[in-house]
Each structure stands twice: as C-alpha cells, then as structure tokens.
Amino acid sequence: FPQDRPFEDTCHGNPSHYYDKAVRRCCYRCPMGLFPTQQCPQRPTDCRKQCEPDYYLDEADRCTACVTCSRDDLVEKTPCAWNSSRVCECRPGMFCSTSAVNSCARCFFHSVCPAGMIVKFPGTAQKNTVCEPASPGVSPACASPENCKEPSSGTIPQAKPTPVSPATSSASTMPVRGGTRLAQEAASKLTRAPDSPSSVGRPSSDPGLSPTQPCPEGSGDCRKQCEPDYYLDEAGRCTACVSCSRDDLVEKTPCAWNSSRTCECRPGMICATSATNSCARCVPYPICAAETVTKPQDMAEKDTTFEAPPLGTQPDCNPTPENGEAPASTSPTQSLLVDSQASKTLPIPTSAPVALSSTGKPVLDAG
C-alpha cells in the first residue's frame, strides 16, 4: 500500500520504533529485558517485566508467587494473571470462616437448616446458609424436603457450620500440609510434565458422590466430585483440566467443576497450532526466528553468536549479540542431573532421561 510508505519511513528513521506490516503501523520497540503487553506497543508503558509462570508482577514491579488453590477445600475463582495473583475461594457447598490474602485459610460446609427452618439465604463461598422459621405457606426458598418441614418450637437462625475434615487452620496456600509423598498420586496425573514430581501433592481419595451443597435425603442436588485440577465432563467422568504451565501459555479461564481450564498464548505471542482448550504451539508475534542468523563457531573456543539483520528489517525481537569484549575463556561442562526417582515414578511421554550439563555446561542426566 503506497499510502503506508510515509508511516514506514518514519519508523525506519527512529531506532526506538519498528514498522509492523501486520498491523501497518509503527510500534514502540520494548527495551531489552522488557516484554510487550500488546501486539504493537505504542509507548514505554506498554512494556513490562516478564515473570515466570505462576508469578505475577506486583505493584512494586516485583515478580511474586500467585497463591495456589490446591487444598482440597479450595477452587480457583480467578486465574493467575501477569499483574494479579490467582484468587481462591471455598469449594461449592462450603464458605470461608477465616479469610487470607487472595484465598481462604479455613472453609466450613454450609449448614443444613434444621427441622422447622427453611433457607432464607443460600450459602455462598463467603457466607454460611441463613435459616428462618418456616412460614405457613410453602416458601420459594424451600430447596429440599429437608428444609421444608413443619415448624417446631424454638427457632435457630443459623445452624452450626461443619468444618471440613480435617479442619485446616493454617493460612497456607501451598499444596498439602504434612509431607504427603508426591509419588502417591503420580499414576493418575497423566498430563504432567515428565520431570514434574506431581501436579498436586495430595493423596487422592475416592471421588464418590459429593453435593454441590450438602446433600440431604431427598435432595437431587448431588453430583460426583472430582479431584482438584479435574472436571466432570459431559459423560460424567472426572477428566484432567489442561495445564497452562508451559512457558508460553497463560490461563484464560480456570478449571471449574464442570469445565476444563483453557489456556491461551502469552501476550506478545500468537497461536500457530491450536489444541483442545489450549494452544499446542505459540510463536512470538511478530515471528522473528527466521530473521536471526546463526554463525556457527567452535563451541570449545567461543560460543555461538547471533547476528541481527540490519536495523529496521526485524520487528521487536531481541537477539542477544556478543558484546564487544575479547573472547571469554570457556570453563568445563556442568551437568545438571534431574532426580531420576522423580521421573521414574511418573508416566513419561519421552524415553530420554532429563539431564542438565553445565560447562563453563549443566546437563540433566538422570543416568
């Protein structure tokens, strides 16, 4: 488009910008060490520090761990995002009695209204069920036969809540208290990365039937309960939620009791190969791998260097050129050994052992 030429030219003359053909506009080139928050950054505020998966950038610009909702009585309310922590709340059928930052330290089961009482306000993740004396007429709040009995003498506005067993008094947001061996549930976690010791360090129990709220006799409000990180599929089977723990993915929607987690590519990347509820391959946007020229050299003498193409020919990619120093001396190889026990107890999709070797090389050699 000839009319775009003037815009393109203005980018070429400005080293802090580049021209993005896809969006046909000048984009701000994020400085080294910062990551674009959008496809075509316009200003420095569109660039940010990048955190590892499961960390978010706090107000002070520090990468801080997102809380984890891996305790049995918690579910994820909002996912871990680049600028905010994951938020956990009590499972359906439970409410929070002791709150914690972005989570709940102690969840109790919702009360079931006793004889002669009916539900005034159903329990939520934050509040227990509120009961009131049954009125002569049938109340629309009468959710189950148990809650619709004739009134009896004496009124109890709210029944005593039942703590989850065992009650958790710690405000911890990490998986399991008490050192449960991770390998115990390894066999059931098929979607885990080969070297991940376990996706949630908790012994699994029979899913059985569990109420979305307490399940009194005669109530139809019962459903099968799945382990954390599993959801109930259309066929009524507990199915693993997809994991967004790959580096280039972020969580779009959380793992819910009846739907999988969904993942999407990180800001600054686009999906090249889609997958169910996720993306199989994310590529940097714009794609700049082809623009990087590798100059092979003898690794023992000097490590591979990257030559960037002429300025203005590549979008916001930052190949790391050698600095102008004299060749550095190369030290011996370091091997980073991955604990073979961790991998041997898990279903491993690859036959290769995990090893890190470090030379002046870490090699992960599980032997």
């Epitope: 990551f35 960390y55 520090r62 801080t64 990365a193 010791p197 599980a366």
Partner: antibody
Framework: AAAKPGAAVKMSCKAS????????MHWVKQRPGQGLEWIGY????????DYNQKFKDKATLTADKSSSTAYMQLRSLTSEDSAVYYC?????????????WGQGTTVTVSS | DIVLTQSPKSMAMSVGERVTLSCKAS??????VSWYQQKPGQSPKLLIY???NRYTGVPDRFAGSGSGRDFTLTISSVQAEDLADYHC?????????FGAGTKLEIK
Amino acid sequence: AAAKPGAAVKMSCKASGYTFTDYWMHWVKQRPGQGLEWIGYINPNTAYTDYNQKFKDKATLTADKSSSTAYMQLRSLTSEDSAVYYCAKKTTQTTWGFPFWGQGTTVTVSS
Amino acid sequence: DIVLTQSPKSMAMSVGERVTLSCKASENVDSFVSWYQQKPGQSPKLLIYGASNRYTGVPDRFAGSGSGRDFTLTISSVQAEDLADYHCGQNYRYPLTFGAGTKLEIK
C-alpha cells in the same frame, strides 16, 4: 576454570531429556563456605532475561535453542567472583523451588 | 530484597538425636519456602518445598513446618549420612533469596 582479574569467562549448561524451551533456566552462585545467591534466569524460548540487581553488570545470560544450551558470561572478573556457579531448573510448579541442579562450574580468579 | 536468617550457623549432633533448624524471613513469604541439603562437594538437593512438603524420595525423618516468616526443618532422628549444609530459600518474590546455611556435623 581459572581466569585472570579483569578477564571474562563464559560457562554453559546443556540440558537434555526435556523440552529446553519449556522451562526457564536459573543460575546460582556459591562462594566457598557461604550460602547460595540467585543470579538471574533466562526464558530460552524468548531469550527474555531477568537479573538480581547485584549481578546486572556482572552476568549476561543467553541460550541456544538449537543445542539446548544455556550460557552465562561473567565479565570484569575479580576475586569476589571466585565461586561455584550452578544452573538450576524448576518443575512445572515454579513456586516449589529447584529440584534439578547442574553439578556446578568452579571459577577461580587469580593473577 | 527478602532476607532469610538461618540459625544456628552450625551444630554437632549424635546419631539418633532430633535436630531442629530455623529459618526466619524479613517479611511474609507465605509458605513459599524450600529446604535444600548440600553434602560436601555436591550440588544442593531439594528436601522440602512449600514449607512442609517432602520432595520425592526424601526420607520421612525430614519434616518442614511454618508459614509467614518463621520456618523450621526437623530431622527426627539424625543419621550419619545427614552430615551436610542445609539451606532455606524463598520462592515467594524475586529476586529469589537463600539463607546463609546451617552446617550439621555428626559427633
């Protein structure tokens, strides 16, 4: 590796048995008889790096996806840089710490 | 930066004794604390993650506890092979930091 004051040294960390680009590579320093110090990390997939402020002018982290190798270059060496340097890797549960460590590269700086 | 203070700096124990190592954080780190064992001439080895969870293959005599700012590693019955340095580390906020370590010697 032995090096002279003022020189630079480059060490490497070759990974195998997992997808190199799926995990960030961390580097940790340990001076003789002392504790561990986190230097920084690199996302091998995007070449994104972040450093402990203390090492920003000392270390440069790079990665070569084709050979599944991470590198750390230390410049302007002094006796304070004499230490064992480890590369370390987390699992998918990034908040768990480091189950996987390289065996370490010893750097000795002396004239 | 978050500072982790380990105590004691060193201790000598007899086989079979109970050992308690302390790690205090300068600010809240929730439960994002790991404990590492480092034997002479070796790389650190993960023992405990998430303050209280034993990593795969770690003997059950090792136990971690605590949350917030105070953390403890307990070896219920110390063995000769436990001679090592023990480091605590926080994974809560970057930059990641470690304690100076506790050297455990066997009498």
